[in-house]
Interface confidence: medium
């Protein structure tokens, strides 16, 4: 029995619902009483949802899954996963048994956009050209891990003396803190870009130092 799933990962934002597509080709005269359908986590074999003996056996996965009962008879064995979490990321296997047996695995990629970075400066007063300052760029609650880039006001990348740390919170979302140590020129703008590689999302933050006083651009 040929079971079909999408080749590409299904991408879902944290908090939204995802449909893990799975289909088979029922023969003429097929009855749901003949169908055994199991969704399980590919790696751990944990049961997620099942259909057997003509009945939806329900969710075994935090009550966040559902089948499409009206479409099962047409060969649509897709699974709806509600309120997606980071922990849901991974491979799900769809097993279909009528007389023959077939299975296929579909990958779920979870994503969350990063917040607009906040910028802090240490020290933040009495700054003079030649002083060494530490600029921190912080962006929150994204997934997966971000790529962080720094540049000066002319768009020249700043790669030296950058330290970036990413910490996952209890939901598995990452908070990113990137620290740039730089020797001040007469004045200058320093920008950080936090990129979500899955969503191709760019979040920008910048700080402008103009001798005294120092100004932060207003939030757009």
């Amino acid at each position: 029995l040929e079971v079909q799933v999408p080749e590409d990962p299904v991408v879902a934002l944290v908090g939204t619902d995802a449909t893990l597509c799975c289909s088979f080709s029922p023969e003429p005269g097929f009855s749901l009483a003949q169908l055994n359908l199991i969704w399980q986590l590919t790696d751990t074999k944990q049961l997620v949802h099942s259909f057997a003996e003509g009945q939806d056996q329900g969710s075994a996965y935090a009550n966040r899954t559902a089948l499409f009962p009206d479409l099962l008879a047409q060969g649509n064995a897709s699974l709806r996963l509600q309120r997606v979490r980071v922990a849901d990321e991974g491979s799900f296997t769809c097993f279909v048994s009528i007389r023959d047996f077939g299975s296929a695995a579909v990958s779920l990629q979870v994503a969350a956009p990063y917040s607009k970075p906040s910028m802090t400066l240490e020290p933040n007063k009495d700054l003079r050209p030649g002083d060494t300052v530490t600029i921190t760029c912080s962006s929150y609650r994204g997934y997966p891990e971000a790529e962080v880039f720094w540049q000066d006001g002319q768009g020249v990348p700043l790669t030296g003396n950058v330290t970036t740390s990413q910490m996952a919170n209890e939901q598995g979302l990452f908070d990113v803190h990137s620290v740039l140590r730089v020797v001040l020129g007469a004045n200058g703008t320093y920008s950080c870009l936090v990129r979500n590689p899955v969503l191709q999302q760019d979040a920008h933050g910048s700080v402008t130092i103009t001798g005294q006083p120092m100004t932060f651009p207003p939030e757009a």
Partner: antibody, heavy 120, light 107 residues
Framework: EVQLVQSGAEVKKPGESLKISCKAS????????IGWVRQMPGKGLEWMGI????????RYSPSFQGQVTISADKSISTAYLQWSSLKASDTAMYYC?????????????WGQGTLVTVSS | EIVMTQSPATLSVSPGERATLSCKAS??????LAWYQQKPGQAPRLLIY???TRATGIPARFSGSGSGTEFTLTISSLQSEDFAVYYC?????????FGQGTKLEIK
């Protein structure tokens, strides 16, 4: 360069069927979502639905579910929007637009629009 | 479905001045919010996505902000070519609904 070229304007009678097209070029057709947006005369944009040509998976707005069918032909990099029985209220400009290679993306590139007029 | 509400319906601003357009979502959409510009007889054009990321080729005078349910599009110094209709769209969850539009007109 990404381009979406739509078929020409159509004038139809109520009850007739219609299939309009959107020919894509400049990118890998099978790996990006492509969708349709309606704009009735003098009104705003309405999201109708999208399709992933790679596997044919689609999503519809509840307002358009069962009213239209979105399909795609990978072999000629073309997406379609079709009606089996047109109504006067289907008179509108229809735009095709390409999203990203993941579903949660806005519409980056737009076709020039196809004007559909349904009148007896 | 998520309902998007834009305000004001019409905004009259003089060239060179700043324009601020608002968009509200009926429930949280994180930062999955896009802005489009449409001129008469033309297809819409993507300006901003992920609430604040400018699309390729969009001038720096266009900026977006917001998260959750409230979003803003700001045009810092209006040029003659900026007078058009602007739509917001949530791209958080299907159906990806649009707001009803804000017409930006010359004062």
């Amino acid at each position: 360069e990404v381009q979406l070229v739509q078929s020409g304007a159509e004038v139809k009678k109520p009850g007739e069927s219609l299939k309009i097209s959107c020919k894509a070029s400049g990118y890998t057709f099978t790996t990006y979502w492509i969708g349709w947006v309606r704009q009735m005369p003098g009104k705003g944009l309405e999201w109708m639905g999208i399709i992933y040509p790679g596997d044919g998976g689609s999503r519809y707005s509840p307002s358009f579910q069962g009213q239209v069918t979105i399909s795609a032909d990978k072999s000629i990099s073309t997406a379609y929007l079709q009606w089996s029985s047109l109504k006067a209220s289907d008179t509108a400009m229809y735009y095709c637009a390409r999203g990203g290679n993941y579903i949660s993306f806005p519409m980056y590139y737009w076709g020039q629009g196809t004007l559909v007029t349904v009148s007896s | 479905e998520i309902v998007m509400t834009q305000s004001p319906a019409t905004l009259s601003v003089s060239p060179g001045e700043r324009a601020t357009l608002s968009c509200k979502a009926s429930r949280g959409v994180s930062t999955a919010l896009a802005w489009y510009q449409q001129k008469p007889g033309q297809a819409p054009r993507l300006l901003i996505y992920w609430a604040s990321t400018r699309a390729t080729g969009i001038p720096a005078r266009f900026s977006g902000s917001g998260s959750g349910t409230e979003f803003t599009l700001t045009i810092s110094s209006l040029q003659s070519e900026d007078f058009a209709v602007y739509y917001c769209q949530q791209h958080y969850d299907t159906p990806y609904t649009f707001g009803q539009g804000t017409k930006l007109e010359i004062k």
